[in-house]
């Protein structure tokens, strides 16, 4: 894992720590919107699309993602954060379907990233939504350090 400086623990990080043993996310300002029941989406139909993905700086080494999604019962959101130049392996994160915002700490400062996200409804993926953003260039808003664990990127060496 890596050590992230500049992130306060939030409700979602606490939820992750208590229930998922992987404390690598926090909610952004307008998070926690609950899906209120499925509108009867079936895999044979076009999946509802996520919209309005915005990515903003959080501290010097973090990004905050906000998105909107149809008021349906999403099972999960799957997020990928990749350096724009693809030098390092992508980082993937799975978050509960009730969230509409998440903080991604532990990134490199002053680095452009491509962020991609999709949702899962009734076992099927929605289309991918992507955005580009850069982390800040200096040390600011230094809070207590928090250890972050990312799982292995998906585009690396392969064993068969």
């Amino acid at each position: 894992g890596s050590t992230a400086i500049g992130m306060k623990e939030t409700a979602a990080a606490k939820f992750e720590r208590q229930h998922m043993d992987s404390p690598d996310l926090g909610t952004g300002g307008g998070s926690g919107i609950e899906g209120r029941g499925s509108m009867g989406y079936r895999g044979s139909e076009q999946a509802p699309e996520l919209e309005n993905l915005t990515v903003t700086e959080v501290g010097w080494d973090g990004l905050r993602l906000n998105w909107t999604a149809a008021d349906q019962a999403y099972e999960h959101f799957i997020i990928q954060v990749q350096e724009a130049n693809k030098v390092e392996a992508a980082r993937n994160l799975t978050v509960p379907g009730s969230l509409r915002a998440v903080d991604i700490p532990g990134l490199k400062a002053a680095t452009p990233y491509t962020v991609s996200i999709y949702g899962v409804i009734q076992g099927y993926r929605t289309p991918v939504l992507s955005a580009e953003a850069s982390t800040a260039s200096g040390l600011n808003d230094i809070f207590e350090a928090q250890k972050i664990e990312w799982h292995e990127g998906t585009h690396h060496h392969h064993h068969h």
Epitope: S22, G43, H76, P96, G123, H151, H158
Partner: antibody, heavy 118, light 108 residues
């Protein structure tokens, strides 16, 4: 770097159950999706189902619904696939595999041979 | 479940040939498609994901294209190591999904 190591070969009687394990190392096991795929002798690949250990919820292929149970133990970084009511046509090599962001299976276990015979 | 149909089931070719394998989905899967190579007694190997993205370490002679219901895997110049069976897989289903029945590429 992810490695998936599966349990050894099994010989089972028709009507019984088999439980195959898949131990992961490298990366954070709880966050990525594990799928189970089987291949009968001389046949193609069949996706059976998969799980994200972080949530513990599994999705299954229609064909196997009700007969397969996929679980995961985060404390040991191990995924399990249990297939019940075995019949001779379940004789196959069973693979576990890790999915990438787009669902492609980029790391595979070595395979576990399950033979169903009376 | 979404059905995947591959063609041809067997393909005879020579080293240096350009080879194309097609895969058709029973309904639109956008670009949620992967291609694999498998050799006898071995686990499959991921070649292409997201319909056209080349997996790390896979030679550039492999390419994928298509979206919706029609997809192709192309090997621009067949090499001795490429004689194997190839499978497509739809990934619209989460966390993964159904495979095509496979295409065996054999020596002519």
């Amino acid at each position: 770097q992810v490695q998936l190591v599966q349990s050894g070969a099994e010989v089972k009687k028709p009507g019984s159950s088999v439980k195959v394990s898949c131990k992961a190392s490298g990366g954070t096991f709880s966050s990525y999706a594990i799928s189970w795929v089987r291949q009968a002798p001389g046949q193609g690949l069949e996706w059976m189902g998969g799980i994200i250990p972080i949530f513990g919820t599994a999705n299954y292929a229609q064909k196997f619904q009700g007969r397969v149970t996929i679980t995961a133990d985060k404390s040991t970084s191990t995924a399990y696939m249990e297939l019940s009511s075995l019949r001779s046509e379940d004789t196959a090599v069973y693979y576990c595999a890790k999915g990438n962001f787009y669902g492609g299976l980029d790391y595979w276990g070595q395979g576990t041979t399950v033979t169903v015979s009376s | 479940d979404i059905q995947m149909t591959q063609s041809p089931s067997t393909l005879s070719a020579s080293v240096g040939d350009r080879v194309t394998i097609t895969c058709r989905a029973s309904q639109s899967i956008s670009s949620w498609l992967a291609w694999y190579q498998q050799k006898p007694g071995k686990a499959p190997k991921l070649l292409i994901y997201d319909a056209s993205s080349l997996e790390s370490g896979v030679p550039s002679r492999f390419s994928g294209s298509g979206s919706g219901t029609e997809f192709t895997l192309t090997i621009s110049s067949l090499q001795p190591d490429d004689f194997a069976t190839y499978y497509c897989q739809q990934n619209k289903k989460f966390p993964s999904g159904t495979f095509g029945q496979g295409t065996k590429v054999e020596i002519k």
